[in-house]
């Protein structure tokens, strides 16, 4: 009765990111069924022909699966039971960017839910004194992101401040020619500061901070996924 | 628990193919999870994977030996082959066939291998 | 493709010691890792997978670190049984490839 479609049920997605290179989730959650045989899972991406990923009777059936995802994908298969559809994909490309649906078939009715994937590069950045410069100089650098980030410094005892004019950013393009690294200089330092390097594209935004006194150095790094309710 | 077993020549000459099969019991070739490949070891040597299959037929080959290599399935029988064509002494080696799972794609069982033998 | 290097070659251990094996990558695995066990005339046995996960059956004395280049198996107090020639092997991407081996042997 359910699988004919007369009773639709709830499945919920979030819009996440995938790093170029490493493993990624898309996430995705339906009401539960009882019974594991009577669940299916099917993965869809808007313009691949083939299926992402399907799980049917309580395993993978990738006979119908598209050959771009070959190998690359998942799901929890421990915990389909309790609700969880979220796909995991190994090794993530430029390519892997797009909308993907999460298809939900059991005993009480069928339900879908699209999900927008980036894809990107993004690292947490390290900031340090560089004790080679003739003059007190900062060094914030982070391997691998994508697309081109900005980069801002800021300060805490200057807020508000343009360090654009006492800054310098390189690029520098990574072995596998998609990511860069980045590279930024900061000039003229005071100490008894506190300073932000502040790295943003449209997918993450990355701050490392560095306090510098005359007794020691502290710092921190965070990372957060834009866009992403995760 | 499952089984793999390789079968096939020994002995084969330079410029012919390779056959091999690898027969699957305890269990279903068309376990969804998983691919089927094969890996060999030359003698004394590290291991080189050559290729997998899925129960549908789907392939996909080391692009080393692609343009030598075929992998087929037959579901019937609960086994898949290997065929290498146009093989030379450097393609001598022990011979595996082994599960892999679909993600992760860890190798888990092996056959006990096969050594082929390429000579005149 | 990607190359796996294994080091050392060979590791001389006297049985009840700790073994450090090495394996890295050309570039990052992420996590998609296995390592495997050979003894001589057998094929290989998974020991470990997703750089740190103990395949059903394997002691506990065998444990897998790391990611994205850098690997490492450690078996904690070597047995007889353990001598063998270890292999680790990416799944990152296509080809999968294996790192050339490290010989365990006895001290």
């Known amino acids: 009765f359910g699988i004919s479609g007369r009773h639709s049920i709830t499945v919920t997605t979030v819009a996440s990111a995938g790093n170029i290179g490493e493993d990624g989730i898309l996430s995705c959650t339906f009401e539960p069924d009882i019974k594991l045989s009577d669940i299916v899972i099917q993965w869809l991406k808007e313009g691949v022909l083939g299926l992402v990923h399907e799980f049917k009777e309580g395993k993978d059936e990738l006979s119908e699966q598209d050959e771009m995802f070959r190998g690359r994908t998942a799901v929890f298969a421990d915990q389909v039971i309790v609700g969880n559809a979220s796909l995991r994909l190994k090794n993530v490309q430029l390519t892997d960017a797009g909308t993907y649906k999460c298809y939900i078939i059991t005993s009480k009715g069928k339900g879908n839910a699209n999900l927008e994937y980036k894809t990107g590069a993004f690292s947490m950045p390290e900031v340090n004194v560089d004790y080679n410069a003739s003059s007190e100089t900062l060094r914030c650098e982070a391997p691998r992101w994508f697309p081109q980030p900005t980069v801002v410094w800021a300060s805490q005892v200057d807020q508000g401040a343009n360090f654009s004019e006492v800054s310098n950013t390189s690029f520098e393009l990574n072995s596998e020619n998609v990511t860069m690294k980045v590279v930024s200089v900061l000039y003229n330092v005071t100490i008894n500061n506190t300073y932000s390097c502040m790295i943003e594209n449209d997918i993450a935004k990355a701050t490392g901070d560095i306090k510098v006194t005359e007794s020691e150095i502290k710092r921190r790094s965070h990372l957060q996924l834009l866009n992403s309710k995760a | 628990q499952l089984q793999l077993q390789e079968s096939g020549p020994g002995l084969v000459k330079p410029s012919e193919t390779l056959s091999l099969t690898c027969t699957v019991s305890g269990g279903s070739i068309k376990s969804g999870s998983y691919y089927w490949g094969w890996i060999r070891q030359p003698p004394g040597k590290g291991l080189e994977w050559i290729g997998n299959?899925?129960?549908?037929?789907?392939?996909y080959y080391n692009p080393s030996l692609r343009s030598r290599v075929t992998i087929s399935v037959d579901t019937s029988k609960n086994q898949f082959s290997l065929k290498l064509s146009s093989v030379t002494a450097a393609d001598t080696a022990v011979y595996y066939c082994a599960r892999e799972g679909s993600y992760p794609n860890q190798f888990d069982p092996w056959g006990q291998g096969t050594l082929v033998t390429v000579s005149s | 493709e990607i190359v796996m290097t294994q080091s050392p070659a060979t590791l001389s251990v006297s049985p009840g010691e700790r073994a450090t094996l090495s394996c890295r990558a050309s570039?990052?695995?992420?996590?998609?890792l296995a390592w495997y066990q050979q003894k001589p005339g057998q094929a290989p046995r998974l020991l470990i997978y997703?750089?740190?996960t103990r395949a059903t059956g394997i002691p506990a004395r065998f444990s897998g670190s790391g990611s994205g280049t850098e690997f490492t198996l450690t078996i904690s107090s070597l047995q007889s049984e353990d001598f063998a020639v270890y292999y680790c092997q990416q799944y990152h991407s296509f080809p999968f490839t294996f790192g050339g081996g490290t010989k365990v042997e006895i001290k």
């Open positions: 997703g750089a740190s």
């Open positions: 299959i899925y129960y549908s037929g789907s392939t």
């Open positions: 570039q990052s695995v992420s996590s998609n």
